[in-house]
């Protein structure tokens, strides 16, 4: 399903292959090359086509080359010159260069700010119905529930933290043990990956950057079902994670600490508290029975309350019912006892929007949602093309050198474990891991970040969400310490065991090669991410849900045939790539099963079909609607108005043929500019801060 | 203040019915529960029943049952209580008290009392 | 019924005399138990509720104590305006029910 390869800085022409790379699968980046092509900023790069093969004078003058998508671009300064400029054109550079800043860090605030209100539309629209997953009973005995009950909970509460503490109090009033609590937090860490999945679905509009930031975002969710298939069943044979953490839990003499310090929320929260806040207790009360939650509401109307414990005198219907026998009297015509009530007195009003409307939480969830949705986009095409303007020429040298560049030898390994750190402490940083990879989404889409070098900072991101979840642990009132704490330790050393999986040994590395395969696949048929989502973030945990309430022996019916199948493909796929003589000729490839079995062709035509009606209504709409149309229609030519995702028409009639990514014009504006974002003129006047 | 004001004494012959008043005043009538208590010449007090002016829940104890009859009128704060089948050892000073609903406190404010006396 | 036993049923001291005057119940009924006086001509007045705590504007002379069974109203200094008939009522379970009282007097 790779993508043809294609000459290093060919023109893209349909018509003209390069003989021989039909079977080759894109290569590793070549550090060096990519290093080369940056510093020489000043070479003219030569646009030659793919000449017939007798054509032997071209193809000695400029090396046949294969151009991988995976390469990082070439983000060439098309400004002037600092040192051509005078100073009034300095001073407005410098101010503009300012401007950019304030800009950028004004719409990454607003990226996150989306984000916290997302998680709370979220919560709005399934908090309930997560609560509820959580009081099925046959969590206890059933890991493969418990998991797939910690995907969706978290996935429709947005939060893992949400979700893990809801564990951790029902851990702590002995709803759930602690051993049927660690599938719910195996499953709560790869619900946490939805959300930079989504973030980097509003990237859709260019496709080789679209390619790099879904393979980014989706190398998390790759990194956490690959340990969760591993790590799992070992748990379950040999409950290792339990053991351990009770071992460490019961050799310390915790005493309580203080709150995990709150460092991004103190800035975001003054103005997402204006939009919407939430009473997350309703949530633990539904997933601990608590009939009277399930009438509440999440959105908190009252922020100031009173709370009085007092004394109440109620009726019983005789004197054998009091609730102590020396507080129980009668007035002669009723009997009387004591009951010890905490009544609360609302004082003051919450400030937030919707505080006086009184809609039921799905219709504040529902418009939360679209809007979130709408500035997070919009946020991040105004973040990508800000940091598209800034990060050029020498800048982009030296930042992509600073992030991607190893240390020197003999001390290279040491790069990537560097990288979980800083990946871990600046997830501390932010309190959540979510904000954190979805900030990194679109750095590794316009190509500033490489996937090599986003998986240690988002393993290192899964690691830093757990510390904070310790801090946390740290500082929870004395009965619910022991539980909370080995609940963190749980999910600290589930991520450390995923990262001796599947990061130490660069073989061991497949969370990188399938998300590649997958950015691949999405940026051929962009359907296919929206698909990929649905799929493993909603229809095989819900499945997995159904067949579990059904019972074992329908869970092992239907599990066992579909394992063994998977098994039996992936043997087969192993087989015909490695060795294919073993295998009889029909198997040596796919050919033998039918077109819509094997390749996405078919499926892309009924999406088209499908999706037809959208590609009409879908012209002269906002840049926003575009993006989501496009990203459903895989529609080139129906955006022409607003051209936020038209692609090199050649490109779409030459299916197998890869779409021409920016890089391979002169510069970003250039590429820009042939998609008809940025007027001509602009590039004139962009300068560069070195 | 609070004022519990009872009605006038009554003569009354045996096999007859009497009605005695309490009329209050200086507290809400709804919140308080009317106790009536009978004092026998030289003896000790007996309850007679309870009303609750705001639901006209009544209680009666089991020997006044059938025969006495507990009533409130909530627009005059007044409470009432008709004993029938008078006979002569129900000569007695009858009280009236209140008694705050819900509350442990017992009869904290009392009527004067109206005395009864049955005779042929 | 819950019978209430006072005793003694009368009582003759000095003023400034400290004065004990018991109530036994019949059976349990907790703290459930109220004080009265009643002085010659006039209606009961509460001094005491839930076997000790005192009613509004009553002495701090008076006091009550006990619980359970046994329970006893203390004049610690018997003043001349004391002189009364002092009635013990239980209303742990209905019927409420009196003592048959204690009537004090000074020699």
């Known amino acids: 399903m790779a993508p043809w390869p294609e000459l290093g800085d060919a023109q893209p022409n349909p018509d003209k292959y390069l003989e021989g790379a039909a079977g080759q699968q894109p290569t590793a980046p070549d550090k060096s090359k990519e290093t080369n092509k940056t510093d020489n900023t000043e070479a003219p790069v030569t646009k030659i086509e793919l000449l017939p093969s007798y054509s032997t004078a071209t193809l000695i003058d400029e090396p046949t080359e294969v151009d991988d998508p995976w390469n990082l671009p070439t983000l060439q300064d098309s400004g002037i010159k600092w040192s051509e400029r005078d100073t009034k054109g300095k001073i407005l550079c410098f101010f503009q260069g300012i401007g950019r800043l304030i800009l950028l860090l004004g719409f990454l605030y607003f990226f996150v700010c989306s984000l916290d209100i997302l998680s709370s539309a979220f919560q709005l629209v399934g908090g309930k119905m997560a609560g509820q997953f959580f009081s099925n009973s046959s969590i206890m005995s059933n890991p493969l529930l418990g998991l797939v009950i910690g995907v969706l909970v978290t996935v429709l509460v947005q939060s893992s933290s949400t979700s893990t503490s809801i564990v951790v109090s029902m851990v702590s009033s002995s709803l759930l043990t602690v051993r049927a609590a660690i599938p719910i937090i195996m499953g709560a860490n790869i619900g946490t990956s939805i959300t930079n999945t989504i973030v980097a679905l509003m990237q859709v509009g260019d496709r080789s950057e679209f390619r790099r930031a879904f393979a980014g975002a989706t190398v998390h969710d790759f990194f956490n079902w690959l340990s969760v298939l591993v790590l799992l069943p070992v748990e379950v044979a040999t409950h290792y994670l339990e053991i351990i953490t009770q071992l460490i839990v019961e050799s310390f003499h915790f005493k309580n600490g203080e709150d995990a310090p709150d460092l991004l929320k103190v800035i975001t929260k003054p103005f997402t508290k204006l939009i919407v806040q939430l009473d997350k207790k309703v949530i633990s009360q539904i997933a601990m029975n608590d009939e009277k939650a399930k009438n509440k509401s999440l959105v908190k109307i009252w922020c100031k309350t009173f709370t009085n414990k007092t004394q109440i005198n109620v009726t019983v219907p005789s004197t054998a019912n009091c609730t102590s026998p020396s507080l129980c009297w009668t007035d002669g015509i009723q009997n009387w006892t004591m009951k010890n009530v905490t009544y609360k007195e609302n004082i003051a009003k919450c400030q937030h929007i919707f505080v006086n409307f009184h809609l039921p939480d799905l219709a504040v969830g529902t418009i939360l949602l679209i809007l979130s949705l709408l500035v997070l986009c919009g946020c991040l095409i105004m973040i990508v093309k800000i940091l598209g303007s800034v990060l050029k020429g020498q800048v982009a040298t030296v930042i992509k050198k600073t992030i991607n560049t190893d240390f020197p030898f003999p001390f290279a390994w040491l790069t990537g474990y560097l990288a979980i750190l800083v990946g871990a402490g600046m997830t501390f940083i932010v309190q959540s891991s979510s904000v954190f990879t979805s900030a990194l989404t679109p750095l590794i889409g316009i190509g500033v970040i490489t996937i090599e070098r986003a998986y240690p900072l988002t393993l290192g991101s899964n690691i830093g969400t757990t510390t904070t979840a310790i801090l946390a642990a740290l500082a929870s009132p004395g009965n619910a310490l022991r539980s909370s704490l080995q609940i963190a330790l749980c999910h600290f050393f589930f991520n450390i065991s995923g990262i001796l999986l599947w990061y130490p040994i660069p073989f061991t590395r497949l969370p990188i090669r399938m998300a590649k395969g997958l950015g691949n696949i999405s940026a051929k048929y962009r359907w296919f991410a929206v698909f990929y989502l649905i799929i493993f973030f909603f229809l095989i945990p819900l499945t997995v849900f159904g067949l579990s309430l059904a019972g074992w022996r329908v869970l092992v019916g239907v599990g066992v045939p579909v394992v063994f199948i998977i098994i039996l493909v992936l043997c087969l796929r192993l087989l015909q790539s490695r060795c294919p003589r073993v295998l009889p000729k029909k198997l040596q490839n796919w050919n033998f099963l039918p077109l819509w079995m094997r390749s996405l062709k078919p499926w892309d035509a009924v999406v088209s079909k499908f999706t037809g009606c959208f590609q009409m209504r879908c012209c002269c709409c906002c840049r926003v609607c575009c993006r989501a149309c496009c990203l459903l229609c895989d529609c080139p030519k129906c955006c022409r108005c607003s051209k936020c995702c038209e692609d090199l028409e050649e490109a779409q009639e030459g299916q197998d043929v890869p779409v021409k990514a920016p890089e391979t014009f002169d510069n970003i504006t250039i590429s820009r500019e042939a998609q008809g974002e940025v007027p001509a003129s602009d590039s004139k006047t962009e300068c560069t801060a070195l | 203040q609070v004022q519990l004001v009872q009605s006038g004494a009554e003569v009354v012959k045996p096999g007859s019915s009497v009605k005695v008043s309490c009329k209050t005043s200086g507290f809400f009538f709804t919140e308080y529960i009317i106790h009536w208590v009978r004092q026998s010449p030289g003896q000790g007090l007996e309850w007679i029943g309870g009303?609750?002016?705001?639901?006209?829940?009544?209680n009666y104890k089991q020997n006044f049952r059938g025969r006495a009859t507990l009533t409130a009128d909530k627009s005059t704060s007044t409470a009432y209580m008709e004993l029938s089948s008078l006979r002569s050892e129900d000569t007695a000073v009858y009280y009236c008290a209140r008694w705050r609903n819900a509350y442990y406190s017992a009869m904290d404010s009392w009527g004067q009392g109206t005395t009864v006396t049955v005779s042929s | 019924d819950i019978q209430m036993t006072q005793s003694p049923s009368s009582l003759s001291t000095s003023v400034g005399d400290r004065v004990t005057i018991t109530c036994t119940a019949s059976?349990?009924?907790?703290?459930?138990v109220a004080w009265y006086q009643q002085k010659p001509g006039k209606s009961p007045k509460l001094l005491i509720y839930?076997?000790?705590t005192r009613h509004t504007g009553v002495p701090e002379r008076f006091s009550g104590s006990g619980s359970g069974t046994d329970f006893t109203l203390t004049i610690s200094s018997l003043q001349p305006e004391d002189v009364a008939t002092y009635f013990c009522?239980?209303?742990?379970?209905?019927?409420?029910?009196f003592g048959g009282g204690t009537k004090v007097e000074i020699k």
């Open positions: 059976q349990d009924v907790g703290t459930a």
């Open positions: 839930w076997a000790s």
């Open positions: 009522q239980q209303y742990r379970t209905s019927p409420l029910t």
């Open positions: 009303i609750i002016p705001n639901n006209d829940v009544t």
